[in-house]
């Protein structure tokens, strides 16, 4: 079942519900964090819980089996079904933005390719709810700084349209 923190409006689908492979990660984050990095998976999008669970599994499979990572790289994944999928969660260092940024940021990735379109309103609300949740839980500083993936690494992620969108979010700071 999706779990909902009293301070959050955005439910988080736990790993066991989307049938994640067991994590092999051990590196803990030091909370609260100052940065959030937004990316996209650049793969298929999904708009139902079933298809988003499938997509989360496929991203994790690729990250673990081909890239050799200890888990899916992102701390959280966002589906166009309006749900947040737990990746490494708030406590474990991700593999989303390079060795400099991973230990000091939470990586959230929108499942899909957002070069030419923006995510659904449900997905955007889910991401914003997650960030509010992070602050309420003490995982993110109240004055956290939001970055786009391309702000911290040489990449097209999070896609042109999503990048333009997050630039208007209150915590976004340009490089």
């Amino acid at each position: 079942q999706e779990t909902e923190d009293p301070a959050c409006c955005s439910p988080i689908v736990p790993r066991n519900e989307w049938k994640a492979l067991a994590s092999e990660c051990a590196q803990h984050l030091s909370l609260p964090l100052r940065y959030v990095v937004v990316s996209h998976t650049a793969g298929s999008s999904c708009n139902t819980p079933a298809s988003c669970q499938q997509q989360a599994r496929n991203v994790q499979h690729y990250h673990m089996k081909t890239l050799g990572w200890c888990d899916v790289g992102y701390n959280f994944l966002i589906g166009e079904d309006g749900l947040v999928y737990e990746g490494r969660g708030w406590n474990f260092t991700g593999a989303h933005s390079g060795h400099l940024w991973n230990p000091m940021s939470i990586g959230i990735s929108f499942m899909g390719n957002y070069m030419d379109r923006v995510p659904t309103p449900q997905a955007i609300r889910a991401a914003q709810g997650l960030l509010a949740c992070g602050v309420a839980q003490g995982a993110l500083r109240s004055n956290y700084v939001l970055k786009g993936h391309r702000d911290v690494q040489r990449t097209l992620s999070p896609g042109n349209q999503l990048y333009h969108l997050i630039q208007n979010w209150p915590h976004y700071r340009s490089p």
Epitope: A22, E24, Q54, N58, H61, Y62, K65, G68
Partner: antibody
């Protein structure tokens, strides 16, 4: 009953191309990762290609990367392997197999195989 | 890539005998992703044991699997005639996914 039936094998010259097919039935094809595995004349098993349930991700060993392409048609329950620039060392029996997250991607069903011989 | 070395390459056992074959990985493999297949002449491989110790459907209880890290084994508590076959270990821990070269089990 789960069935995987390969076809398309045959004799081909070095440098040539061949397309293998695998017709699946008896299970929800779109829920499973699919694989091609070959068995050499010396009876060694070699994984050749993998494809995610929704075709988003494909995987290959270096030995075939750039020469082989795995694809699937979930509407038709078919798996394919396009092989090009074939070499003598590609001579083998080619099997398609399925795997899913339920048993941690172990290949729980295999077809009967289709034989590919690369020779001049 | 992870190389799987199976030993012995060929072995023979009498009916009723306890049989153990091993699979050694060149680097550590999660036990969740170490599988075994059985193949008989003229047939395709069959999943036999998955995730180190789980018997596939229809596999007799005299078979068992164990191991962790780089060392894994398949054991038959009491050899029967139908167990004569080649057994392959397989790792799905990291791509490229690899197979051992097989252990051929014959009846003595």
């Amino acid at each position: 009953e789960v069935q995987l039936v390969e076809s398309g094998g045959g004799l081909v010259k070095p440098g040539g191309s061949l397309k293998l097919s695998c017709a699946a039935s008896g299970f929800s094809f779109s829920d499973y990762y699919m694989y091609w595995v070959r068995q050499t004349p010396e009876k060694r098993l070699e994984w050749v290609a993998a494809i995610s349930d929704d075709s988003t991700y494909t995987y290959y060993p270096d030995s075939v990367k750039g020469r082989f392409t795995i694809s699937r048609d979930n509407a038709k329950n078919n798996l394919y392997l396009q092989m090009s620039s074939l070499k003598s060392e590609d001579t083998a029996m080619y099997y398609c197999a399925r795997g899913g997250y339920g048993n941690l991607y172990a290949m729980d069903y295999w077809g009967q195989g289709t034989s590919v011989t690369v020779s001049s | 890539q992870i190389v799987l070395t199976q030993s012995p390459a060929i072995m023979s056992a009498s009916l009723g005998e306890r049989v153990t074959m091993t699979c050694t990985a060149s680097s550590s493999v999660s036990s969740s992703y170490l599988h075994w297949y059985q193949q008989k002449p003229g047939s395709s491989p069959k999943l036999w044991i998955y995730s180190t110790s789980n018997l596939a459907s229809g596999v007799p209880a005299r078979f068992s699997g164990s191991g962790s890290g780089t060392s894994y084994s398949l054991t038959i508590s009491s050899m029967e005639a139908e167990d004569a076959a080649t057994y392959y270990c397989h790792q799905y821990h990291r791509s490229p996914f690899t197979f051992g070269s097989g252990t051929k089990l014959e009846i003595k």
